[in-house]
């Protein structure tokens, strides 16, 4: 049950898709990675306080729980709730592939 | 992937499993649940430090990024791999019924 | 959709162990909160609690045929397993198996009769 | 053990009428009693647990009440359907423990 999208901490505050511009080096891709030279990195970014997009009854849980044992328990956080795909070339030993990769680029988020 | 399962803050203090007692009270469920009384939620709890257990491309990614960029990017974040059924009695307007929960308990953790 | 079906040999001798079988679908015993008990009836009589066992594997029995009764079950295959040793004309009964989610039976399977007679 | 105490074996009632089955236990089991329904050659069904609540599916004509030692299972406007064995269940302490029984005739 994705709960709601209202955001009480003020605008952009909350779990929402971030993208976030990244070299080969700044990934560590450099030695294995030949194309793209630059990833628009899609992740998720931002607080979840209650009930704000809840993935799931687990997440309803955290948040209780939470609330009432905050040093124990820490609140839900912000994860993709799905990906897009991405393709890189990379480097072999022979030369050059093509690898679609399936869990690269969040494509949407909530609070887990 | 799951990588590495050694955790270098030492033991118990990266992301796991951990089982907290909760009343129905305490999980704002009293008005809706008969049965259990109290649930031993098992959740994950702990830190993602690199390469921990990083659940995909994507954990690993924010690992780099997290490192460049920590207040830009956060670290990865310790949620369930998967989850354990459970079964819950509930009111309902009639009566009650059994309902069986498959997001309910954490089953095993990584970091994302 | 909730069945259970039990089964088992239907005649047996004093001082011979029964074993019965409680197969079921519907539901799984890997689901935190949910059991499976055994409960007997003598023709014409009521209800008698022997057994009942958990998700998590723990076990309850009735202390009254306790060092008599092993329960027993198979997750995976979805059955749940009962063993009466040293059985005697008392325990000709009907025995029904019975999903038991926090004490409540709220499936019971046909039941299977059981004579003991020599 | 507790024992669940069904005073009345036989309760003979007519179609349309309100009848009160009751059941008394040994000692306090707060609200943790069911109650079940069997019909002449059938399996038990469940009809109420948590003592007064009825389970998915049951008639609202079906009615649980007390708690502590006293209950009471009453079936208002009585169907022909309901000829059965009534039978209460403590589930407050292992082992659990059935009343036993009460034949319900209709007239």
């Known amino acids: 049950a994705r709960n709601g999208d209202h955001c009480p901490l003020g605008p952009g505050r909350c779990c929402r898709l971030h993208t976030v511009r990244a070299s080969l080096e700044d990934l560590g891709w450099a030695d294995w990675v030949l194309s793209p030279r630059e990833v628009q990195v899609t992740m998720c970014i931002g607080a979840c306080p209650s009930q704000f997009r809840a993935a799931n009854m687990h997440a309803q849980i955290k948040t209780s729980l939470h609330r009432l044992k905050p040093d124990t328990v820490p609140a839900p956080c912000c994860v993709p709730a799905s990906y897009n795909p991405m393709v890189l070339i990379q480097k072999t030993d022979t030369g050059v592939s093509l690898q679609t990769y399936d869990d690269l680029l969040a494509k949407d988020c909530h609070c887990i | 992937a799951r990588n590495g399962d050694h955790c270098p803050l030492g033991p118990g203090r990266c992301c796991r499993l951990h089982t907290v007692r909760a009343s129905l009270e305490d999980l704002g469920w009293a008005d809706w649940v008969l049965s259990p009384r109290e649930v031993q939620v098992t959740m994950c709890i702990g830190a993602c430090p690199s390469q921990f257990r990083a659940a995909n491309m994507h954990a690993q990614i924010k690992t780099s990024l997290h490192r460049l960029k920590p207040d830009t990017v956060p670290a990865p974040c310790c949620v369930p791999a998967s989850y354990n059924p459970m079964v819950l009695i509930q009111k309902t307007d009639t009566g009650v019924s059994l309902q069986t929960y498959d997001d309910l308990l954490a089953k095993d953790c990584h970091c994302i | 959709q909730v069945t259970l079906k039990e089964s088992g040999p239907g005649i047996l001798k004093p001082s011979q162990t029964l074993s019965l079988t409680c197969s079921f679908s519907g539901f799984s015993l890997s689901t935190s909160g949910m059991g499976v008990g055994w409960i007997r009836q003598p023709s014409g009589k009521g209800l008698e609690w022997l057994a009942h066992i958990w998700w998590n594997d723990d076990k309850y029995y009735n202390p009254s045929l306790k060092s008599h009764l092993t329960i027993s079950k198979d997750t995976s295959r979805n059955q749940v397993f009962l063993m009466i040793t040293s059985v005697d004309t008392a325990d000709t009964a009907t025995y029904y198996c019975a999903r038991g989610a926090y004490d409540f039976f709220d499936y019971w399977g046909q039941g299977t009769t059981l004579t003991v007679s020599s | 053990d507790i024992v669940m105490t069904q005073a009345q074996n036989f309760m003979s009632t007519s179609v349309g009428d309100r009848v009160s089955v009751t059941c008394k236990a040994s000692q306090n089991v707060d609200t943790n009693v069911a109650w079940y329904q069997q019909k002449p050659g059938q399996s038990p069904k469940a009809l109420i647990y948590s003592a007064s609540y009825r389970y998915s599916g049951v008639p609202d004509r079906f009615t649980g009440s007390g708690s502590g030692t006293d209950f009471t299972l009453t079936i208002s406007n009585v169907q022909s359907d309901d000829l059965a064995d009534y039978f209460c269940?403590?589930?407050?302490?292992?082992?659990?423990?059935f009343g036993g029984g009460t034949k319900l005739e209709i007239k």
């Open positions: 269940q403590q589930y407050n302490t292992y082992p659990y423990t």
